[in-house]
Amino acid sequence: AELFLIASPSHPTEGSPVTLTCKMPFLQSSDAQFQFCFFRDTRALGPGWSSSPKLQIAAMWKEDTGSYWCEAQTMASKVLRSRRSQINVHRVPVADVSLETQPPGGQVMEGDRLVLICSVAMGTGDITFLWYKGAVGLNLQSKTQRSLTAEYEIPSVRESDAEQYYCVAENGYGPSPSGLVSITVRIPVSRPILMLRAPRAQAAVEDVLELHCEALRGSPPILYWFYHEDITLGSRSAPSGGGASFNLSLTEEHSGNYSCEANNGLGAQRSEAVTLNFTVPTGARSNHLTS
C-alpha cells in the first residue's frame, strides 16, 4: 500500500493555516486501525501519533518552509511512509508604510504623551519597524514583531521633540520608508510677570502708567488681560509671543493691586499682584504713586 502527503494549500502565504492529509489511495483507513504521524525534516509535528489522518497547522511562517512527510502504522506495527513533500511558505513583502500620531495631527502639548504609530498595509512574518527623527535620520528605536503596526512612545514631550519623523518597515525584502510627519509642540504659557513703568521714579496724578505683562514661555499668539483689584482694565494681544503693555492715565482711584493674566488657548496663568500706593511727600503739593 502506498501513502501520500497532501498539503492544502500547497503554496501557503505566511501567517495562513495549512492542513496536512495523509492519504492511502488503495486502502480505506476503516479497513484497519491506523495511527498517523506527521514529520518535518526529522522532527515529529503536533501531537505525534494520532488516529486522525489530518493535521491542522494554525499559521505557517517562512521558517516552516521545509520537507514534510507522514507515516501510518497498523495495529500489527507495520509502518508505511509517504514520499517527502516540499512546502514553500511565501512571504509577502511590506508595502504602504505609514506613520500616524496619537494625538492625531501631530500637535501635542508640552509635557503630554506622544505616540508614533508605524503601520504597513501589507507584509507578513517578522517585521522590523524603525523610527527616525529629523531629515538626517537619527535612529530612535527598532522593534521586531509579527504584526502590521508598532508604536514608539515619548511619555512627556519637550520642545526638542518638535521635529520631522518617519518610520521604516522591513521583512527581508529591503527597507520601505513612510512619509515624513511633522510634530508641533504647543507650549502653555508660563506664569507672567507684571511690571509697572512710570515716566519718573514717583509717578504723579495724570502721568501715564504703563502696565507691562510678559510670559517668558508660551506658544503664540498670547492674549494678556490686565486687572485692577480684579476689575478688568482691558486686554492686549501678542501675536508673535513676547509681552504686551496697557497704558493708564493715573488718578487717585488707581491705588491698589494690579495683576495680569496670560492665555494662549492652552490654559491661563495669572501674575503675582503688584501694589501701587499713593504717598504724599512732606511739603509736596501733589500726590505721588509708589509701587
Epitope: 519637550r158 520642545e159 517668558l216
Partner: antibody, heavy 119, light 112 residues
Framework: EVRLVESGGRLVQPKGSLRLSCAVS????????MYWIRQAPGKGLEWVAR??????????YYADSVKDRFTISRDDSQSMLYLQMNNLKTEDTAMYYC??????????WGQGTTLTVSS | DIVMAQSPSSLAVSVGEKVTMSCKSS????????????LAWYQQKPGQSPNLLIY???SRESGVPDRFTGSGSGTDFTLTISSVQAEDLATYYC????????FGAGTKLDLK
Amino acid sequence: EVRLVESGGRLVQPKGSLRLSCAVSGFTFNTYAMYWIRQAPGKGLEWVARIRSKTNNFATYYADSVKDRFTISRDDSQSMLYLQMNNLKTEDTAMYYCVRDNSGSFDYWGQGTTLTVSS
Amino acid sequence: DIVMAQSPSSLAVSVGEKVTMSCKSSQSLLHSSNQKNYLAWYQQKPGQSPNLLIYWASSRESGVPDRFTGSGSGTDFTLTISSVQAEDLATYYCQQYYSYPTFGAGTKLDLK
C-alpha cells in the same frame, strides 16, 4: 554631537563694555530659545538673558539685575549667540554659560567663559 | 520671583549609601494645563558646567543613570540617589521653570 563654545570673557574695568559670543553646533539652532546663565565665584546659578526663536519674533527677556545694561542677540545664519554687556559692575564678575532652553529646563550647557570686573 | 529653598546645604555620605535632598518652592510648580511640575535638577561637578539630570520633576534625562530619581509635586520635591558612587560627588541644584527661571542655592555632596 551638540557643542556650545563660549568666548570673549576677560578682565574689564567697572563701567566698561564687553561682548560674549557662543558658537553652536550639533542641533537646529534656529528653532530653540537660548539663554545666558551666570555663576559668580563660589555661588549659585542665575539666569541673565533669554532670546526666543525667529518664530517668536526673537523676543528677549532680562533679569532685573542686568536690564538696560545687557543685550542678548543671535545670528541664526552663523549659529551664534551674543551677549553685549555695558556699564559693567563688580557684581557682574562670574562664569557666563551659553545654554539651550528645552521646554524650560536647560539640557545643553557650554563650558563657560569668565568675566572679571575689577579696577 | 519664585524662591527655591534647598536642604541640606551640604551632605557627607559614604559610597553605596542612599541619599535624599529636598527642594521647596515658594509657589506651586504644578501647571494646570498639562499636570506637569515645572522643576528640574542639575548636577555640577567641581570645575565643570551643570548637567541636566531630571526634568518635569521626575523624568530622567537621556544617559542619566537610573540611581537618580526625582519625585514630588506642587511645592515639595526630592532628588534621591539610591546608591551613591564616587563620581556623584558634586553640587546639586533644583530649578523652577513655571515662571522666570530661578535656582536653589544647591546641596553639596561630599565623601564622609
